[in-house]
Interface confidence: low
């Protein structure tokens, strides 16, 4: 299709080399067309071209995005050759920064509803460059946290070094919707609620003698509770002794609750004490089994292929730790009475003999 009739917009992404950040392009189609395409289409199923793999017109992605190669080659679709670029409705999301994102991006309606729509397209010329570190040491992050229930603010990273008085007029979007209430370089939130979480975009215009550019930055805002003041607590095992059958497999589960921490580095491990020896056990990875705003429950299992006599003399210890402190829970194994016949006992003794040899050759003192 002919792109010479597309409206043109110039954008600048000055990314920080110190942090991960995203970028978003909006398909700013002229208003009458936009209302068609950025909401559910009202076309009947019979009007859907048969090459589109959707059974229902409401499932159609509303706009199609292309990238224009600088060498004049034909337009490229944003394909899986750009795995870091995601299309969603009327937006194009860049997951990683880099000058290789520089280029021209064109969007147009996926479906043409009237002859006037044929020329309905937008060309966005995107320039991407690293922000000079010298320009501002304390620029706002592209990931900002708001403490639930308190007052907070969201700053536009590209303008956070300027005072409110110096700041140009800023246009803010939240999750793709225009926020018309504020035009300054930061949004002040009187009381933070969960719904303040989301993807914020701030735009301002920068002009030079030749042309004007929209400078854009994207901020991921998360609403959080305050960091915990408690060390983790172990929910399971509760009992310090566990009845077991010799020669049978056994799984002991350790579950612990970790309070929210902005920088979360939970530690959860199993170790075994045997007389004066102590060593950490190689066990399956810990997994998060429940995660809420306030805390996270993490589980890690220790698996014994067969319980031996030696295991009855050992102590199994679950150790958990966060930045506040650590907690442990010890478990002693106790043989179930009347659980096995002579064969079981002989088998268990045989296993124990093999394990003793393995133990002596493989285990060392825990430091």
């Amino acid at each position: 299709f002919n792109i010479s009739g597309c409206s043109t917009k110039k954008l600048l992404w000055a990314y920080s080399t110190r942090s991960e950040e995203e970028f978003i392009l909006f398909c700013d189609l002229p208003e009458p067309q936009k209302s068609h395409f950025c909401h559910r289409s009202q076309l009947s199923p019979t009007q859907v071209p048969d090459h589109l793999p959707f059974t229902d017109s409401k499932d159609l992605p509303d706009v199609q995005w292309y990238r224009q190669p600088s060498n004049g080659d034909p337009l490229e679709d944003i394909r899986k050759s750009y795995p870091h670029i995601i299309q969603d409705k009327c937006t194009l999301r860049f997951l990683t920064p880099g000058v290789n994102n520089t280029g021209s991006y064109i969007c147009r309606p996926k479906m043409i509803k009237s002859p006037y729509d044929v020329a309905c397209c937008v060309k966005m010329i995107l320039e991407v460059k690293p922000q000079s570190n010298a320009s501002c040491e304390n620029s706002a992050s592209h990931k900002q946290d708001l403490l639930l229930g308190s007052t907070g603010s969201i700053s536009c990273p590209s303008l956070s070094c300027q005072s409110d008085a110096q700041s140009p007029e800023v246009t803010w979007y939240k999750n793709g919707k225009l926020l018309s209430m504020t035009r300054s370089n930061r949004i002040v939130v009187d009381e933070v609620y969960i719904y303040h979480q989301g993807t914020y975009v701030c735009d301002y215009t920068q002009s030079d003698t030749a042309s004007s550019w929209t400078v854009r930055a994207v901020v991921q805002v998360r609403t959080i509770v305050g960091d915990t003041k408690l060390k983790p607590d172990i929910l399971d095992p509760v009992e310090s002794t566990l009845e077991v059958e010799l020669g049978k497999p056994l799984t002991i589960s350790c579950k612990a609750r970790f309070g929210f921490e902005r920088v979360f580095n939970p530690v959860m491990k199993w170790y075994i004490k045997d007389a004066d020896l102590e060593w950490e056990v190689s066990v399956p990875e810990a997994k998060s089994i429940k995660s809420t705003l306030k805390d996270e429950i993490i589980e890690r299992n220790i698996i014994l292929e067969k319980v031996t006599q030696r295991d009855l003399r050992r102590t199994f210890v679950c150790f958990v730790q966060n930045s506040i402190g650590n907690t442990t829970q010890s478990v002693q194994l106790k043989e179930k009475r009347g659980s096995g016949g002579l064969n079981d006992i002989f088998e268990a003794q045989k296993i124990e003999w093999h394990e003793t040899v393995r133990f002596q050759s493989h285990h060392h003192h825990h430091h």
């Epitope: 071209p49 793999p53 959707f54 679709d77 394909r79 795995p83 999301r93």
Partner: antibody, heavy 124, light 107 residues
């Protein structure tokens, strides 16, 4: 990296509703399509349907009248309900993430991350 | 619905062999085809998408080709871990459909 954890009962009685949930960890449920696929014992794979995080769905016509797929973005999970089950619905059920590939005239989706699978037996 | 027919249904080969599996679509699907590998008791794993693009992390001995109705998956030099069942999948039109599978066994 993104991981999918499936949960739900392994045994369902005939004529009842099969319910499974898939929890996304290590990434957000947003901006992706999420599918359910099943595999009867010793047989091939059958696509059941997908849901976009916004709630848009598309189902296999062969199952459409009995299937509901829903999403809960706050919990980072999506669910499958299959009503009026019979023995023919006995299968391993998988959830998967669909990665979109936009081609010149079309949108394609391939499943690049899968759940571990849940064996569901329909029996009284 | 578009039907995909894989051949052969099963295949015996040795480590080091070159193996080719074909997938034929009941109507043209452009390049909208993917290949998956499935091992017993495990979920399928994406190998190839868009008929010939190798998924990241997949060894380069796997390759795909074809367009329209005829597609092939080639393993240039079989490794012990390659013995599994392979499925083709079309995503040109809904409903998404899979081939019946090709079981690759050790000779």
């Amino acid at each position: 990296q993104v991981q999918l954890q499936q949960s739900g009962p392994g045994l369902v009685k005939p004529s009842e509703t099969l319910s499974l949930t898939c929890t996304v960890s290590g990434g957000s449920i947003n901006n992706y399509y999420w599918s359910w696929i099943r595999q009867p014992p010793g047989k091939g794979l059958e696509w059941i349907g997908y849901i976009f995080y916004s709630g848009t769905t598309n189902y296999n016509p062969s199952l459409k009248s009995r299937v509901t797929i829903s999403v809960d973005t706050s919990k980072n999970q999506f669910s499958l309900k299959l009503s009026s089950v019979t023995a023919a619905d006995t299968a391993v059920y998988y959830c998967a993430r669909d990665v979109g590939i936009a081609a010149r005239n079309s949108y394609y989706y391939v499943m690049d991350v899968w759940g571990q699978g849940t064996t569901v037996t329909v029996s009284s | 619905a578009i039907q995909l027919t894989q051949s052969p249904s099963s295949l015996s080969a040795s480590v080091g062999d070159r193996v080719t599996i074909t997938c034929r679509a009941s109507q043209g699907i452009s390049s909208a085809l993917a290949w998956y590998q499935q091992k017993p008791g495990k979920a399928p794993k994406l190998l190839i998408y868009d008929a010939s693009s190798l998924e990241s992390g997949v060894p380069s001995r796997f390759s795909g080709s074809g367009s329209g109705t005829d597609f092939t998956l080639t393993i240039s030099s079989l490794q012990p871990e390659d013995f599994a069942t392979y499925y083709c999948q079309q995503f040109n039109s809904y409903p998404i459909t899979f081939g019946q599978g090709t079981r690759l066994e050790i000779k």
